[in-house]
């Protein structure tokens, strides 16, 4: 039986300072039951960039439409970039849990941050 | 086409136990979390479990009482009921969970139900 | 545990008469809610999820709306085979899934 697995196509990714970057993540089932969360940096210092039930993320939206039933696509665009955005990005499963436990991490995706053309 | 059907329901004592089997057919079983959600006669709807791979969440209800699994090289649900009580009394109904978005989890399909009566 | 209230318990109504069912819960569930419509001796049938999203194959006379804690299933026009009883479920915080008492839509 295989087992989730969770793909970040990209290792890394390069935007323009104020353009808009595109991180991609898919997820290869629907369990374990749990949500997925999306990170910048490993460890405890970690940020959290996305989590759809909790907190506010203007600049983060998901790619996929928020509807649509039985989504596997993860993926999240940030908008606005600016050059603090640069670093590793990872799109993290968790079981569903008090509380959730974290599961499986995509590889990653570099951000980089271009300077803007002028 | 998805279809869910339901067996192993009955008449048992309180105290007895019951195996109830949901075969399953249309859908990519092994990637889906699914559910048994059981109704009393004349009553509401009432979730009973819920199994995603190895991961397991149950009624407070039945928590140490009932246990679900699933066989996927058999497309198959499984409840084993034990210690029944009469208020476990009830068509128990598998389901097939869905999402929407990132998570949250609905049914959009049902079995047709099985009947367990615990009466002595 | 989140409570789902539906009311009213039950609705008497004719055909093709709008009918207009509520659910409300104890706490903010977003838009976690589905509705499910239950048949005699039937099991039950996705209707509506995340609110307002109508199931594949579920007539346009269907329609769900609301946020939060307050919520609305409409039947713009109900037809004779919608006799039955809705129930409301959220899956917002799980376990456990709630459902709500049900509505039993009958005829007048």
């Known amino acids: 039986e295989e087992e989730l697995q969770v793909i970040q196509p990209e290792k890394s990714v390069s935007v323009a300072a104020g353009e808009s970057a595109t991180l991609n993540c898919t997820a290869t089932s629907l369990i374990p039951v749990g949500p997925i969360q999306w990170f910048r940096g490993v460890g405890p210092g970690r940020e959290l960039i996305y989590h759809q039930k909790e907190g506010h993320f203007p600049r983060v939206t998901p790619v996929s439409d928020p509807t649509k039933r039985n989504n596997m696509d993860f993926s999240i665009r940030i908008s606005n970039i600016t050059p603090a955005d640069a670093g590793t990005y990872y799109c993290v499963k968790f079981r569903k849990g008090s509380p959730d436990v974290e599961l499986k991490s995509g590889a990653g995706t570099e951000l980089s941050v271009r300077a803007k053309p002028s | 086409e998805v279809q869910l059907v339901e067996s192993g329901g009955g008449v048992v004592q309180p105290g007895g136990s019951l195996r109830l089997s949901c075969a399953a057919s249309?859908?990519?079983?092994?990637?889906?979390?699914v559910s048994w959600v059981r109704q009393a006669p004349g009553k509401g709807l009432e979730w009973v479990s819920t199994?995603?791979?190895?991961?397991?969440y149950y009624a407070d209800s039945v928590k140490g009482r009932f246990t679900i699994s699933r066989d996927n090289s058999k497309n198959t649900l499984y409840l084993q009921m034990n210690s029944l009580r009469a208020e476990d009394t009830a068509v128990y109904y598998c389901?097939?969970?869905?999402?929407?978005?990132?998570?949250?989890?609905?049914?959009?399909?049902w079995g047709q139900g099985t009947l367990v009566t615990v009466s002595s | 545990e989140i409570v789902l209230t539906q009311s009213p318990a039950t609705l008497s109504v004719s055909p093709g008469e709008r009918v207009t069912l509520s659910c409300r819960a104890s706490?903010?569930?977003?838009?976690?809610i589905a509705w499910y419509q239950q048949k005699p001796g039937q099991a039950p049938r996705l209707l509506i999820y995340?609110?307002?999203s109508r199931d594949t194959g579920i007539p346009a006379r269907f329609s769900g709306s609301g946020s939060g804690t307050d919520f609305t299933l409409t039947i713009s026009s109900l037809q004779s085979e919608d006799f039955g009883v809705y129930y409301c479920?959220?899956?917002?915080?799980?376990?456990?899934?709630?459902f709500g008492g049900g509505t039993k839509v009958e005829i007048k």
């Open positions: 389901a097939k969970d869905s999402t929407v978005g990132w998570s949250g989890d609905f049914f959009d399909y």
């Open positions: 995340a609110a307002s």
């Open positions: 249309g859908f990519s079983f092994s990637i889906y979390a």
């Open positions: 479920q959220q899956y917002y915080d799980w376990p456990p899934f709630t």
């Open positions: 199994i995603g791979a190895d991961d397991t």
């Open positions: 706490q903010n569930v977003r838009s976690d």
